[in-house]
């Protein structure tokens, strides 16, 4: 196995929930076999670790939720990589393996006495972020009846309960945004549309759903093309020339694309002088990302995009922005992160990093350039889902009893899954969180429009919403020219 | 976990090799979550179990191969299903998990004494058959540096060593048959070709390779279509009408398809009266299968197909056909298989199955309707590869020593992988077995042609071969009309 000793964040409790967050970036290609991860991440990593710790504190301080039961956690780093996440998941299930080893008499003591374990089993797992990684993790967890609740894995494949029975998510399947895109096309009577998608699961399955739904609505997908996100200029130019050949009839280009594919298209438009010739309709790979449009705003103007609805969680910032390395000792990655974030050395600290010359001064604060993780609400909702599922299970198995009764020792993953699937509660954004028969959550999207707001000033503005099948659009805003 | 107690075939030895064979069919949809498998299988199951047991006997009795070391095995049932195979693979790695548990002090004895284990670790795994299942298994095994040698998993994805480092195979990647198909197209100067593929990894990646290679050779893939194997008549008819619309220019249809997709096309040709209009070029999903052409021979005439080269292994039949349920007790599935094969009850036997009314009589023999598993040679070559890899490793780590020296206790999976990748030996069919840098074996295919051999008598005949890039064709045979 990897020589890397894996760090874990623990919080004690009567019931332990596992979590997989990408605390570090993926291993680089040359480090893949050692499973040696990249640099520490703030949004997708440290913020999610802190969200888990703080949300559990909130749950544990709530007399109405799991009274007399404390929830603890074991947080592990997935590094946004299947092999690492799988290795970490094996740690989650180790306990189940060992208990069955003992049943089978494969672990014995020299004198014949019985052995005991010093670690509580994990009852469920939150995460990981990536769909492809979540699939691998689910393949393993479902063998042990361990429910998994994802906070950003949106692939349609994961809706298949024959394959992924113990998988649930507080985000919608990408099929929902395909539906939203079709509804926009319908609303504006665009009957003849070109289509582009990024090679890979996200783009391919998304575009397939878009095409199927379009066909049912009598929308003609005139021509359909695919391209790799990292394709060269030549490939993008070739694609743009094909799209140009279908003008003016197919002016609308539906793009189920990763952000960098959209950027490649915009750059090709610039090279071929095609700014303003197309109206792009983009999926949430584009959303409201500035790294997609930077330097190519003129080409992007008019673009309509889909964005998952998830407002900032203000109370998380209240907690997070006060954290300091000298007091936040329960997060084992925090000192490493602090030094990386401020490019300085924490002198005299356990994890002092000598690669930084400058010493960290005490006036540093996380408020500087703070951006909350865009998926924060989903992460917290996933944790709450697990708590409410356990709460409902306790209510039904231990009526009139506060705490863990014998019927909940050990926790039966099948019963927990049933309880989780029936869970509904008010999520952090005020929306109802609930799960359909596939363990998916309702689709709630904002419709964004990229506009020229003033001379050389461009921005995304919210022009509508799509909530579980209902499209609302501010048509005047979509079609109005710039607000000078 | 599943309430099913998993049966295992064991053979003791100094070194234990794991194997995954589809001893039973996949679980039906309603049994998937219990991972309750289907009926017992002869070719893909029982024959492979017996091949492993007998091949290890041959190896152990060979004084030139691993002298003073006996190879044993632990054979598990994959049921041609990812979840079952993964569950079984966890059993293979359990030992590694427990030994590290002990290092970490997570398993302790009540009186503080040390615990011991009663099971040898697995050094490598043979199988499983299916690519998608092999991928899942590899994801797990590589975390523990356990080499895996596959005997029929041909997906191109598995060549990616950044993803699947510990995976090797004695069969070629499907990229090779795509190359073979392109070489046939080139040979006959077919410059304008239609293409069809089955939805799913096999068809999609195969067709993608075929298209890429065709483009480089200046072959125009006029139109490309995909279809599900289980698509309805309407879908097949629609596809055939599209193909018809490109006649006569695109008469050749290259089909990277599963057998049942080809059958669907043949049936649609009958319905639309298109027999003889196309020349089909099929991948090894069609090969020389009669279940593809039965009842639709006229439509299939002229078809050229690719088939993996694998002659029968005569010495295996010598062993296998003599097996009887009263004496073959080491194969735990054999009695179940015997009763299933002859639809009778083994009275007084441990696994007597009361669902059969008829009692098995003693004159029954496996010779009746015997067909050797078409992949038998590959299964045996995979086992030999493991043995030769271990042999070479022993020679380099224990020079001048017969048996397992300390340097091989425990066996280091990384070193074993290196040794396996350098292995080359003469396989059961007399061909050289060796592995390229991706752990793949050379491509050796037979080119088959489906012909009318006489009035209403049709068959596949061998009209050529493709051996590691070299195409040989008997052109006269291909283009001659039927031999009446």
């Amino acid at each position: 196995q990897s020589s890397e000793r894996r760090v874990v964040a623990h919080m004690p409790g009567d019931i332990i929930i596992g979590a997989l967050f990408s605390v570090h970036h993926q291993p680089t290609v040359d480090k893949v076999h050692e499973r040696k991860c990249g640099a520490v991440r703030e949004q997708y990593g440290i913020q999610r670790v802190e969200a888990m710790l703080h949300t559990l504190e909130r749950i544990n301080s709530d007399p109405t939720l799991l009274p007399n039961i404390t929830l603890g956690c074991e947080i592990r780093d997935s590094c946004w990589h299947s092999a690492v996440a799988l290795e970490q998941s094996i740690e989650f299930i180790r306990d189940s393996l060992i208990s069955s080893e003992e049943e089978e008499g494969l672990v014995r003591c020299v004198d014949g006495s019985s052995s005991f374990r010093s670690k509580k089993p994990i009852v469920g797992v939150i995460g990981p972020g990536s769909s492809s990684v979540a699939i691998q993790v689910q393949n393993l967890l479902q063998l042990f009846n361990i429910p998994q609740i994802a906070y950003s894995a949106t692939s349609m494949d994961l809706s298949d309960k024959t394959l992924f029975k113990y998988f649930m998510r507080v985000v919608p399947s990408d099929a929902q945004q395909a539906r939203a895109m079709v509804d926009i096309v319908k609303r504006y009577n665009w009957t003849y549309v070109s289509a582009v998608h990024t090679e890979g699961n996200y783009g391919e399955s998304g575009m397939e759903a878009f095409k199927d739904m379009s066909a049912k609505e009598g929308i003609c997908i005139a021509h359909s093309y695919k391209i790799y996100s990292n394709a060269g200029e030549q490939s993008f130019d070739k694609l743009l020339k094909k799209l140009r050949s279908h003008l003016p009839k197919a002016r609308v280009v539906a793009c189920f694309c990763e952000g960098m594919t959209v950027r490649g298209l915009l750059m090709a438009m610039r090279r071929l002088g095609l700014a303003g010739e197309f109206l792009l309709l983009g999926s949430d790979g584009w959303a409201d990302r500035y790294d997609v449009t930077d330097g190519y705003q003129r080409e992007a103007v008019g673009g309509i995009t889909i964005k998952l609805q998830s407002p900032d969680v203000k109370w998380f910032d209240d907690y997070y922005l006060k954290l300091r390395p000298e007091t936040n000792l329960r997060n084992p990655w925090f000192q490493e992160f602090w030094q990386h974030r401020f490019q300085c050395r924490l002198e005299g600290f356990a994890q002092e990093n000598s690669k930084y010359n400058k010493t960290c001064n005490s006036s540093l604060t996380l408020r500087t350039h703070h951006v909350q993780d865009s998926k924060m609400g989903f992460v917290i909702n996933a944790i709450y889902s697990m708590a409410y599922g356990l709460h409902n299970m306790q209510m039904s198995l231990c009526p009139g009893y506060a705490g863990l009764c014998d019927a909940m020792k050990p926790i039966d993953g099948r019963k927990l899954l049933d309880s989780l699937m029936k869970t509904n509660f008010t999520g952090v954004s005020g929306d109802m969180i609930l799960f359909d028969e596939n363990g998916d959550s309702p689709g709630r999207y904002e419709i964004m429009n990229f506009k020229e707001m003033g001379k050389d000033y461009f921005d995304y503005i919210n022009v509508g919403s799509w909530d579980n099948g209902e499209l609302k659009m501010d048509d005047d805003e979509v079609w109005s020219k710039k607000n000078n | 976990q599943s309430s099913e107690r998993r049966v295992v075939a064991h053979m003791p030895g100094d070194i234990i090799i794991g194997a995954l064979f589809s001893v039973h069919h996949q679980p039906t949809v309603d049994k998937v979550h219990e991972r309750k498998c289907g009926a017992v299988r002869e070719q893909y199951g029982i024959q492979r179990v017996e091949a492993m047991l007998h091949t290890l006997e041959r190896i152990n009795s060979d004084p030139t191969l691993l002298p003073n070391i006996t190879l044993g095995c632990e054979i598990r049932d994959s049921c041609w299903h990812s979840a079952v195979a993964l569950e079984q693979s966890i059993e293979f790695i359990r030992d590694s998990l427990i030994s590290s548990e002990e290092e970490e002090g997570l398993v302790r004895c009540v009186d503080g004494s040390s615990s011991f284990r009663s099971k040898k670790p697995i050094v490598g795994v043979i199988g499983p058959g299916s690519s998608s299942v092999a991928i899942q298994v590899q994801n797990l095994l590589q975390l523990f540096n356990i080499p895996q040698i596959a005997y029929s998993a041909t997906s191109m994805d598995l060549s990616d060593k950044t993803l699947f480092k510990y995976f090797m195979r004695v069969v070629p990647s499907d990229a090779q048959q795509a190359r073979a198909m392109v070489d046939i197209v080139k040979r006959y100067n077919w410059t304008y070709v239609s293409a069809v593929h089955t939805e799913g990894n096999y068809g999609e990646s195969g067709m993608e390779a075929f298209k890429d290679m065709s483009a480089k050779e200046g072959i125009c893939i006029a139109h490309s279509y995909k279809i599900y194997s289980n698509a309805g008549e309407q879908s097949f008819d629609k596809l055939l009408k599209k193909l018809r619309s490109h006649l006569p220019k695109a008469r050749v249809v290259a089909c990277f398809c599963e057998g049942m997709t080809v059958r669907g096309l043949l049936m649609a040709m009958r319905r639309l009266g298109l027999a003889g209009e196309f020349l089909l070029l099929g991948s090894d999903g069609w090969a020389d299968r009669y279940d593809v052409t039965d009842g639709y021979q006229r439509e299939a005439v002229g078809g050229i197909t690719i088939k993996l080269q694998s002659p029968d292994v005569k010495w295996f039949d010598d062993y296998y056909l003599k097996l009887r349920p009263e004496t073959n007790l080491r194969n735990p599935w054999f009695q179940e298989f015997w009763q299933h094969r002859f639809q009778c009850r083994l009275e007084g036997f441990a696994q007597e199955n009361s669902k059969y009314n008829k009692t098995c009589n003693s004159s029954l023999t496996l010779r009746t309707h015997h067909v050797q598993d078409s992949k038998m040679g590959f299964v045996i070559n995979a086992i030999y590869s493991m043995a030769y890899g271990l042999h070479n490793m022993q020679m380099s780590l224990c020079p001048g020593y017969a048996g397992l020296c300390d340097a091989m206790k425990p066996i280091d999976g990384r070193k074993l992988l290196d040794s396996l990748m350098k292995t080359n030996f003469t396989g059961v069919s007399g061909d050289m077995i060796l592995f390229d840098e991706n752990g793949d074996s050379p491509g050796r295919y037979e080119i088959m042609n489906f012909k009318e051999m006489g009035k209403d008598y049709f068959d596949y005949i061998n009209v050529g071969s493709w051996d590691n890039g070299e195409l040989k064709m008997d052109d006269d045979e291909v283009w001659s009309k039927k031999n009446n």
Epitope: E57, R58, N60, S61, P311, V313, K314, W315, D317, D318, Y319, L321, K322, L323, T327, N328, T426, V428, S429, G430 | -
Partner: antibody
Framework: QEQLEESGGDLVKPEGSLTLTCTAS?????????MCWVRQAPGKGLEWIAC????????YYANWVNGRFTISRSTSLNTVTLQVTSLTAADTATYFC???FGVGGYSFNLWGQGTLVTVSS | AYDMTQTPASVEVAVGGTVTIKCQAS??????LSWYQQKPGQRPKLLIY???TLASGVSSRFKGSGSGTEYSLSISGMECDDAATYYC????????????FGGGTEVVVK
């Protein structure tokens, strides 16, 4: 059961200082709570002053506080204190200690009975 | 800053009647809204949190609703004992705020 009790309210001269104490019983600060101070001037509404997170000691103040109020906690004594300096007549109010709970964001499910602070010369 | 505007400042309602109090936030508070009842000389009492969840032991005659920036509290079947001042409070953040409470609504029962 869970209870909060404020003490330290008094008649103080303008520009004077005061320390108010909130003692918790029935629950422990070693768990995680936002403990807050809220005041209410005679005949007026509720006005939030400050909160402290018991597990980390992080503090939060209303924008108008301007450094005149300091909140702190003692985990061992299970107390939260509010130090008030440079008092003026506008600070005359009943000062309540409140505990925020769990999933309701900052929702105060437990209040003390209040302690009266009068600023007068 | 999150300013909470409560209307009306006072209201009279007959016994058995229904009263609705509104609370508007200056920006979305994601349903992190609580309602309190305070009687003269007493401490405030939590009625509702998360916009619509009834606190333990509170009568179902009290009903909270709303989302985003607009919230309301309805009390049906008014009883004399419901005479009190009612406050809304945003619970989404305690950073960069002047006051988390609304100005209060005095409810007089006739």
């Amino acid at each position: 059961q869970e209870q909060l009790e404020e003490s330290g309210g008094d008649l103080v001269k303008p520009e004077g200082s005061l320390t108010l104490t909130c003692t918790a019983s029935g629950f422990s600060f070693s768990n995680y709570y936002y403990m807050c101070w809220v005041r209410q001037a005679p005949g007026k509404g509720l006005e939030w002053i400050a909160c402290i997170y018991t597990s980390s000691g992080s503090t939060y103040y209303a924008n108008w506080v301007n450094g005149r109020f300091t909140i702190s906690r003692s985990t061992s004594l299970n107390t939260v204190t509010l130090q008030v300096t440079s008092l003026t007549a506008a600070d005359t109010a009943t000062y309540f200690c409140a505990k925020s709970f769990g999933v309701g964001g900052y929702s105060f499910n437990l209040w003390g009975q209040g302690t009266l602070v009068t600023v007068s010369s | 800053a999150y300013d909470m505007t409560q209307t009306p400042a006072s209201v009279e309602v007959a016994v058995g009647g229904t009263v609705t109090i509104k609370c508007q936030a200056s920006q979305s508070i994601s349903s992190y809204l609580s309602w309190y009842q305070q009687k003269p000389g007493q401490r405030p009492k939590l009625l509702i949190y998360r916009a619509s969840t009834l606190a333990s032991g509170v009568s179902s005659r009290f009903k909270g609703s709303g989302s985003g920036t607009e919230y309301s509290l309805s009390i049906s079947g008014m009883e004399c004992d419901d005479a009190a001042t009612y406050y809304c409070q945003q619970g989404t953040t305690i950073s960069d705020v002047d006051n988390v409470f609304g100005g209060g609504t005095e409810v007089v029962v006739k």
